[in-house]
């Protein structure tokens, strides 16, 4: 649970002020563009050559609370006729996001930043070959 | 930058206890999963076939402050033979995911949860063909 | 540089199993599936078996579905294909295929036999 070396310095105070009490800071209510949202997929993940499925984690103690992971359907990828070519790779797109984790001790509430690795969908590749000698 | 309706809940204290002064709320010093990363992509972007280039933005009042953002590099997808196939579509994949914002007036430090959309990679898709009469 | 040890092959009766092991050692990270392809003489390669490191997600050839399991372990970066039900067509040399996403790494290749 230690802090980045770039978190480091972007928690801390400028040099000139008195330095905040250790381990806690203060978090405004809300959240900014909080109304942005991905643009309808347009069934991307069923016409993709590389299609996948979601699953939908949800935890209530966490913002927020349902995260979608990615799938992907095949090892290969769907060629024009709708076969799957095992020549080429069907292969997840990975990001890492923050959370936000609520942890009680009754009626004492704070919260903790989490980094969460997300599948976002996939992606067809060509791989190169290697012979194993 | 109001709380969405999932939101409102998540922030509340449990109903039994005092409520939470209005406005803001203890966040813990410290990343869980810090060290989680996305594994080395070995250029699944240069391989794809649909291809895409990265951009890092920076900002230094943001955790984190530096965001890596995909563009598609063709508007078709790469064949077989290595052209271009523009009968298929290189498509952008979207995730909504959390940033820290770091705002400051003096020696008053607070942050505050903002939602951004990142463009993680691109996918080859088949679109749908519709003749307008 | 990855290496692939592939195990197993040998000469059998219609109707009987075998089951042929692959290890992968040297640099062989972020694994994205482990399977087998076979061939026979003046034939293209054909796809027998994959499993997906991730999940243990699996996909078999029409060919071989319901007498031919893939496992791993994970731990020791292997994967075992146990066929069950030879058939004389199954008579093929048999390549162990490692891929890591853009790179495909193939085994030499272990000699399976069915004879009627």
């Known amino acids: 649970q230690r802090v980045p070396k770039e978190g480091q310095t972007f928690f801390q105070k400028p040099e000139s002020c008195p330095s905040v009490p250790e381990g806690s800071l203060k978090l405004d209510l809300g959240i900014i563009n909080a109304n942005q949202r991905v643009p309808l997929s347009r069934n991307i993940e069923r016409r993709s050559t590389s299609p996948w499925n979601y699953t939908v984690t949800w935890d209530p103690n966490r913002y927020p609370s349902e995260v979608v992971q990615a799938q992907c359907r095949h090892l290969g990828c769907v060629n024009a006729q709708g076969k799957e070519d095992i020549f080429m790779n069907s292969v997840p797109i990975q990001q890492e996001t923050l959370v936000l984790r609520r942890k009680h001790q009754g009626c004492s509430v704070s919260f903790q930043l989490e980094k969460l690795l997300v599948t976002v969908g996939c992606t067809c590749v060509k791989p190169l070959i290697h012979h194993v000698h | 930058q109001r709380v969405p309706k999932e939101g409102q809940t998540f922030f509340q204290k449990p109903e039994s206890c005092p409520s939470v002064p209005e406005g803001s709320l203890k966040l813990d010093l410290g990343i869980i999963n810090a060290n989680q990363r996305v594994p080395l992509s070995r250029n699944i972007e240069r391989r794809s076939t649909s291809p895409w280039n990265y951009t890092v933005t920076w900002d230094p009042n943001r955790y984190p402050s530096e965001v890596v953002q995909a563009q598609c590099r063709h508007l078709g997808c790469v064949n077989a033979q290595g052209k271009e196939d523009i009968f298929m579509n290189s498509v952008p994949i979207q995730q909504e995911t959390l940033v820290l914002r770091r705002k400051h007036q003096g020696c008053s430090v607070s942050f505050q949860l903002e939602k951004l959309l990142v463009t993680v990679g691109c996918t080859c898709v088949k679109p749908l063909i519709h003749h307008v009469h | 540089e990855v290496q692939l040890v592939e195990s197993g092959g040998g000469s059998v009766q219609a109707g009987d199993s075998l089951r042929l092991s692959c290890a992968a050692s040297?640099?062989?990270?972020?694994?994205?599936?482990f399977g087998w392809f076979r061939q026979t003489p003046g034939k293209e390669r054909e796809f027998v078996a994959g499993?997906?490191?991730?999940?243990?997600?699996?996909e078999y050839a029409n060919s071989v579905k319901g007498r031919f399991t893939i496992s791993r372990d994970n731990a020791k970066n292997t994967v075992d294909l146990q066929m069950d039900s030879l058939k004389p067509e199954d008579t093929a040399v048999y390549y162990c295929?490692?891929?890591?996403?853009?790179?495909?790494?193939w085994g030499q290749g272990t000699q399976v036999t069915v004879s009627s």
């Open positions: 040297g640099r062989a990270n972020s694994i994205n599936w």
């Open positions: 499993i997906r490191w991730s999940d243990a997600y699996t």
């Open positions: 295929v490692l891929d890591l996403s853009t790179v495909r790494y």
